[in-house]
């Protein structure tokens, strides 16, 4: 592809403070978000006749963090094929050689909104449980490939007006160090599990904590643990859930344990008070049962000690969620990750540049040879559990349809996806 690549295939357009140089098939570019990795635009794919999201990774090898994340994202997007994880439709670079190589463009499915926008809506139990079910299916699929996310948050989960949901990114690399006393970076930490905040070991149910935080936010309409930094984040957790047991404290590193044990002791607030009946939908007797189930699920997900927290499988079988259970979605075959050293890779910048370039060239080669599907697949599994047309869940009618696929949008261009302040 690089041999035959010519300037006539591309055109440039100014988007915000960046120049997008994209294939001519992608027209009507419009910025929809910006994140740590770059700017995201909505566009119309004139070949497929669909709207897509085009994400520009500008100099993805500029430092170790960007390089590792870009390489990991490329490899995983190419391997993972599940209806609850965003699909990669195309990858390209306008540069012709490795020496010139500067930018990577990822073309993905375009969704209608991210969960930040859904949080401000009055969701009924049907919609809420279906969104949570899909989140859990996507997470379980990642776990089956050995990918533990650790950084799920509303800005990186996108939905369509028919209530279908997809996870946008792959979270923190296994090698990403998270230190309790670390300098606070400008990232959203509200959804990170105690074991991540406290620099402990972690297992798959680290992601259940994040789902619990997101569910709590969908119910309350505001962030449930809104700390200003790691330390304050921990304070917000214990103020509401109570100081954890001595058994939990024993699992902490000495310096962290010393800090945690010297915090004021909190008894914790009952879940009936944290999530009272009146904040849930309550239009029928059935809603009262569902409210009780929802609160029970929250109480099992928002458990500080990971050894006592519900697992993904258990959550999928919970009465609040299990009504949607479909083995084709919840037990989809695991993706085959072709880079066995993906999480452990350490390279100099010049090597990262080469690895990322190879991944892009590999995609271009495969698509040139017709290996890559020339249409968006509806993922590896078909949905038997999608609610019937008669169900009101098929339309989140009041949703803002400002299209979005802004991964890691802690600073979004769209005001409606900005930080959440007061509760409704």
């Amino acid at each position: 592809m690089s041999d035959s690549k010519c300037d006539s295939q591309f055109y440039s357009v100014q988007v915000a403070d960046s120049t997008f140089t994209v294939l001519k098939r992608y027209q009507q570019l419009k910025p929809i978000g910006s994140g740590a990795q770059g700017i995201v635009c909505a566009a119309f794919d004139t070949v497929l006749g669909i709207n897509v999201a085009v994400k520009k990774l500008s100099r993805p090898f500029q430092n170790q963090t960007h390089a590792k994340r870009a390489y990991r994202e490329l490899v995983l997007l190419k391997c993972v094929n599940h209806k609850n994880i965003i699909s990669l439709l195309n990858v390209f670079t306008p540069q012709k050689t490795l020496e010139e190589f500067q930018d990577v463009y990822l073309v993905m499915e375009l969704m209608d909104a991210n969960l930040c926008q859904v949080i401000h809506m009055e969701l009924d139990h049907e919609r809420m449980s279906y969104l949570l079910y899909q989140m859990l299916c996507g997470i379980k699929h990642l776990h089956s490939a050995g990918i533990i996310h650790r950084d799920l948050k509303p800005s990186n989960i996108v939905v369509k007006s028919d209530c279908t949901l997809k996870i946008l990114d792959f979270g923190l690399a296994r090698t990403a160090c998270t230190n309790f006393m670390m300098t606070p970076y400008v990232v959203t930490r509200y959804y990170r599990a105690p074991e991540v905040i406290l620099g402990m070991g972690y297992k798959e149910n680290v992601d259940i904590w994040s789902v619990g935080c997101i569910m709590g936010e969908l119910v309350k309409g505001c962030v449930i643990f809104q700390g200003t930094d790691h330390i304050d984040q921990w304070n917000k957790v214990i103020e509401q859930l109570g100081t954890p047991s001595a058994e939990f404290m024993k699992k902490l590193q000495p310096t962290v344990r010393n800090y945690v044990e010297n915090r004021p002791k909190y008894p914790g607030i009952k879940f009936e008070e944290l999530f009272p009946d009146w904040i849930f939908p309550s239009e029928s007797e059935r809603d009262k049962i569902k409210t009780s189930q929802a609160r029970d699920l929250l109480s099992k997900m928002l458990v500080i000690d990971p050894d006592k927290r519900i697992s993904v499988d258990e959550a999928l079988r919970h009465p609040y969620i299990t009504v949607w259970y479909d083995p084709a979605e919840a037990e989809a075959p695991p993706p085959q990750i072709y880079d066995a050293q993906l999480e452990e890779r350490e390279h100099a910048i010049e090597e990262w540049k080469e690895l990322i370039y190879k991944e892009v060239m590999d995609w271009e080669e495969r698509s040139k040879n017709g290996v890559v599907k020339d249409q968006p697949s509806d993922a590896a599994v078909s949905s038997n559990a999608t609610p019937s047309q008669s169900s009101s869940i098929n339309d989140i009618s009041s949703m803002s349809t400002e299209q979005t696929l802004a991964s890691d949008t802690d600073s979004s261009l769209d005001a409606s996806t900005g930080p959440l302040e007061g509760c409704r």
């Epitope: 170790q64 963090t65 020496e99 970076y185 100099a348 080469e354």
Partner: antibody
Framework: EVQLLESGGGLVQPGGSLRLSCAAS????????MSWVRQAPGKGLEWVSA????????YYADSVKGRFTISRDNSKNTLYLQMNSLRAEDTAVYYC??????????WGQGTLVTVSS | DIQMTQSPSSLSASVGDRVTITCRAS??????LNWYQQKPGKAPKLLIY???SLQSGVPSRFSGSGSGTDFTLTISSLQPEDFATYYC?????????FGQGTKLEIK
């Protein structure tokens, strides 16, 4: 055993050129990146340039950009540094070094480059 | 460019002493920090990589710690062969940069 042997250093006039070579042995040369690091007399270490395993990706310190060119011949297990428009401040011992992961784990013994009229 | 600042620039100590050298980066470099030892007329030698990992063959009295912007090299009990100049280096982004060095001398 990893061995890196630099050659090509010497005395050159300002504005002149010099080509340094580094013969590598004891490891699969084409596998990883290589760097040049220099040390002016009595001073600290200064990274000069790096090149990826295939030779397609190169990086330079601002102080040498446009004047120095790093290259490699994987069939000969040799790393090169072409130095043009040399200046007095380029006087230093030049070390060839092997990149391993994100660090430099083996260094040659160095070759002295003196730029003086 | 990321600036690396070492302190102290020189240090006098005795055999058996515990010695600490610090290195500060002008911006966060995660754990992408390496420590090198150099003796007069010799090439540098890698001691610690990734902030805290000991290079094979290096005595266990050498240890490294830190993350983000502040890093430390510690020699738990100085030996005669440890008197040398020590450099930190970041490998987080190009241009890769070194600290100015810390000369460790016999008291």
């Amino acid at each position: 055993e990893v061995q890196l042997l630099e050659s090509g250093g010497g005395l050159v006039q300002p504005g002149g050129s010099l080509r340094l070579s580094c013969a590598a042995s004891g490891f699969t040369f084409s596998y990883g990146s290589m760097s040049w690091v220099r040390q002016a007399p009595g001073k600290g270490l200064e990274w000069v340039s790096a090149i990826s395993g295939s030779g397609g990706s190169t990086y330079y310190a601002d102080s040498v950009k446009g004047r120095f060119t790093i290259s490699r011949d994987n069939s000969k297990n040799t790393l090169y540094l072409q130095m043009n428009s040399l200046r007095a401040e380029d006087t230093a011992v030049y070390y060839c070094a092997r990149g391993h992961g994100s660090n430099i784990d083996y260094w040659g013994q160095g070759t002295l480059v003196t730029v003086s009229s | 460019d990321i600036q690396m600042t070492q302190s102290p620039s020189s240090l006098s100590a005795s055999v058996g002493d515990r010695v600490t050298i610090t290195c500060r980066a002008s911006q966060s470099i995660s754990s992408y920090l390496n420590w090198y030892q150099q003796k007069p007329g010799k090439a540098p030698k890698l001691l610690i990589y990734a902030a805290s990992s000991l290079q094979s063959g290096v005595p266990s009295r050498f240890s490294g710690s830190g993350s983000g912007t502040d890093f430390t090299l510690t020699i738990s009990s100085l030996q005669p062969e440890d008197f040398a100049t020590y450099y930190c280096q970041q490998s987080y982004s190009t241009p890769y940069t070194f600290g100015q060095g810390t000369k460790l001398e016999i008291k």
